[in-house]
Interface confidence: low
């Protein structure tokens, strides 16, 4: 059946070196365990993470994300997932495309990641 893919609707913020979680879900919610779920980096669509046939497809992942991503699928039975990016870098900032594919149906949504410098938030008065 048909569905829509829905992102968070606002930018996700993370500090350099921290983890970021980019949520994505299908509506109406249904079991997505058997679906293909993926994340592309927009606009050049390098593969950030790909989940197919019940397994993460590490070989298809862009080198700069290898070993740094995890698909959080505790709620995949309800059609909800999130991409966790570890050790966030400034170069991770930008647009991501999340997609769900169910046999002959595929839809996408967008998620924006904002990366911030942790040192920017130090109160200068503390350093005096």
């Amino acid at each position: 059946g048909q569905f829509r893919v829905i992102g968070p609707g606002h930018p996700i913020r993370a500090l350099v070196g921290d983890e970021a979680e980019l949520p994505c879900r299908i509506s109406p919610g249904k079991n997505a365990t058997g679906m293909e779920v993926g994340w592309y980096r927009s606009p050049f669509s390098r593969v950030v993470h790909l989940y197919r046939n019940g397994k993460d497809q590490d070989a298809e992942q862009a080198p700069e994300y290898r070993g740094r991503t995890e698909l959080l699928k505790e709620s995949i039975g309800e059609g909800k997932v999130a991409l966790r990016i570890q050790n966030v870098r400034f170069s991770d900032e930008g647009g991501y495309t999340c997609f769900f594919r169910d046999h002959s149906y595929q839809e996408e949504a967008a998620v924006e990641l904002k990366v911030e410098d942790p040192f920017y938030w130090i109160n200068p008065g503390v350093l005096a």
Partner: nanobody, 117 residues
């Protein structure tokens, strides 16, 4: 605003081939692909391609159809071989991508593909 220009539909006999092309103006795509809708049926995915080169196909067309794209020229082409009457439908090009800082989806007007037996 993204304009999609489709070409290449027509009438072909069973076992024949056709080539569909779709050109997008205005923005770089995230994915571009082809969907089809036969009378009385829902619109369904035929083949879709990310600008990074990853391609997905409907099971019914695997091994017969090939999608290729050029993310510099913003075009996507569907080569359809070994066509059969079940492939008869209106074929629609779909663009998704970032347009003026928002993620958008655009559909083409559709091109008729008819396979006669």
């Amino acid at each position: 605003q993204v304009q999609l220009v489709e070409s290449g539909g027509g009438l072909v006999q069973t076992g024949g081939s056709l080539r569909l092309s779709c050109a997008a103006s205005g923005s770089m795509f995230s994915t571009m692909g082809w969907f089809r809708q036969a009378p009385g049926n829902q619109r369904e995915l035929v083949a879709i391609m990310s600008s990074g080169g990853t391609a997905n196909y409907a099971d019914s067309v695997k091994g017969r159809f090939t999608i290729s794209g050029d993310n510099v020229k913003n075009t996507v082409t569907l080569q359809m071989n070994s066509l059969n009457p079940e492939d008869t439908a209106v074929y629609y090009c779909r663009f998704t991508g970032w347009v003026k800082s928002s993620f958008s989806t655009y559909w083409g007007q559709g091109t008729q593909v008819t396979v006669s037996s």
